[in-house]
């Protein structure tokens, strides 16, 4: 369970890939689209509000083998919209929603090498936000392999 309903901290940051492509958000036909692209030098990077929550649970309850605290994050690029995992479609989507947010909006934060981070679906352990064909997608990572695959690594810059 997530400890408390309010985040322990929040920060505004731009999100980019390991290869320094920017994650951008565009309003199209009354819905938001998410792009992974090289930004022109003069273009301002989109900022995302990251809200961090503590999650505390015994492994027997979570089923993910973790027996202590984890750091969960939600990502909101604009008011009332949050990134959400669509596990059926293996996609990452922006949805308008009210609090309390659904579990699909929560991701377990992993600190990685090179000061990168990864975002693992709360609803589907072993599945991470990643980059596929210049879009964000859900990517299953085999836990028997090293989790260092570059397409699930992101950089946060405030």
């Amino acid at each position: 369970s997530i400890t408390g309903i309010s985040p322990i901290t929040e920060s505004l940051a731009s999100l980019s890939t390991y290869n320094d492509q920017s994650i951008t958000f565009a309003l199209e036909d009354e819905s938001y689209e998410i792009y992974v692209e090289d930004l022109k030098k003069d273009k301002k990077k989109d900022k995302v509000l990251l809200s961090y929550y503590e999650s505390q649970h015994p492994s027997s309850e979570s089923g993910d083998g973790v027996d202590g605290k984890m750091l969960m994050v939600t990502l909101s690029p604009t008011k009332d919209f949050w990134l959400q995992a669509n596990n059926k479609e293996h996609s990452v989507e922006l949805h308008k929603c009210e609090k309390p947010l659904p579990d699909q909006a929560f991701f377990v934060l992993h600190n990685r090498s090179f000061n990168c981070v990864s975002f693992e679906c709360k609803t589907d352990p072993g599945v991470f936000i990643g980059v596929k064909d210049n879009h964000l997608a859900l990517i299953k990572v085999d836990y028997s392999e090293n989790l260092g695959s570059e397409n699930i690594l992101f950089k946060l810059s405030e």
Partner: antibody, heavy 122, light 107 residues
Amino acid sequence: QVQLVQSGAEVKKPGASVKVSCKASGYTFISYGMHWVRQAPGQGLEWMGEINPHGGSTSYAQKFQGRVTMTRDTSTSTVYMELSSLRSEDTAVYYCARPSAAYSHYLGIDLWGRGTLVTVSS
Amino acid sequence: DIQMTQSPSSVSASVGDRVTITCRTSQGISSWLSWYQQKPGKAPKLLIYAASSLQSGVPSRFSGSGSGTDFTLTISSLQPEDFATYYCQQAHVLPLTFGGGTKVEIK
């Protein structure tokens, strides 16, 4: 219970190497990174590096790059820190330490070994 | 690397006193700052994480505040067991870095 048990004190000559072990128990070993922090007599805390026990990837402080090697044995839930080309300034207590959150160091380090005193003297 | 400047390096205080320790970082670290207490011959003990969250089991007389580059640890009413050395540590990026420490001594 959740604990980190370190190997015993060592006395080494300058130029030698030392290998300190840290055995974890009471938690899911591969879900938490393991950090090494040292403290010279009467001095402050100095971060040396981290190993991810899941894949074995490492991050070392620049100061120790080329002299330090961190490894792990998942079958025994043990991590090792080897420091080579020892000099007198390496005399310190060496701690292994686990972050309070799985997968992340953002929430600080809440589990520490008792420390291993390494004395470098000719 | 992020530099950590902790002040004062030592403070003399009496039981019941309010003690404030500050930590300044060379660049913004959001709220990713931890505070530790260390007693002679012992390993450090985590007191505060994420700048202001109290670690489980730590007395409520300890509190933390700040974000960005300026942070504070406050002990509202010093107790005999609080005489120790306190360290701040940034947890924002690797390498993790520590402040130089503040020794809280009996006046």
